[in-house]
């Protein structure tokens, strides 16, 4: 996968101090790169703002669960 070699790496250096309502969240992605100082979750809000959050916090894990369950393929 040569294209990924020089791909830019997004890192989080600080985490949000406040809990974000799940109604404001649209998606998330995880950051695990060894080039970053810490593992992180980046939430994208419904207004396309990106927010770094601590994956060890329960509200962050609950929010990720909520987003994943929200997008389950409906049973026919």
């Amino acid at each position: 996968q040569p294209d990924a070699i020089n791909a830019p790496v997004t890192c989080c250096y600080n985490f949000t101090n406040r809990k974000i309502s799940v109604q404001r969240l649209a998606s998330y992605r995880r950051i695990t790169s060894s080039k970053c100082p810490k593992e992180a979750v980046i939430f994208k809000t419904i207004v396309a703002k990106e927010i770094c959050a601590d994956p060890k916090q329960k509200w962050v894990q609950d929010s990720m669960d909520h987003l994943d369950k929200q997008t389950q393929t409906p049973k026919t």
């Epitope: 998606s27 992605r29 995880r30 695990t32 593992e39 994956p55 669960d65 987003l67 994943d68 997008t71």
Partner: nanobody
């Protein structure tokens, strides 16, 4: 560097059981949802089961519901797949993966860091 190593596959007769294990390293395991997928020769990768970081929420493919159980031991950085009442159509290479993006648990693009897989063969 994130690494996933599966084990526990093998040859089993129809109706038998196997327990697969996937050991993860290089990440804070307990904060990641994990999934099991399988791929049979000539077929697309198929979702089997997934579990959230804390182990409180699981989801299964219809084809394995009631027969397979996914679980995890965060102290051992390991996710398991207990497979009972195996059928010949369960024959495939089984791989675990780390969920990295929001979206349906059953969607492979939501996952990254795939293990090399372990072969499960069910004979009739």
């Amino acid at each position: 560097e994130v690494q996933l190593v599966e084990s526990g596959g093998g040859l089993v007769q129809a109706g038998g059981s196997l327990r697969l294990s996937c050991v993860a390293s290089g990440l804070t395991f307990s904060t990641y949802s994990m999934g099991w997928f399988r791929q049979a020769p000539g077929k697309e990768r198929e979702f089997v089961a997934a579990i959230n970081g804390g182990g409180s929420s699981t989801t299964y493919a219809d084809s394995v519901k009631g027969r397979f159980t996914i679980s995890r031991d965060n102290a051992k950085n390991t996710v398991y797949l207990q497979m009972n009442s195996l059928k010949p159509e369960d024959t495939a290479v089984y791989s675990c993966a780390v969920k990295m993006y929001s979206g349906s648990y059953s969607s492979p693009p939501g996952y990254n860091y795939w293990g090399q897989g372990t072969q499960v063969t069910v004979s009739s």
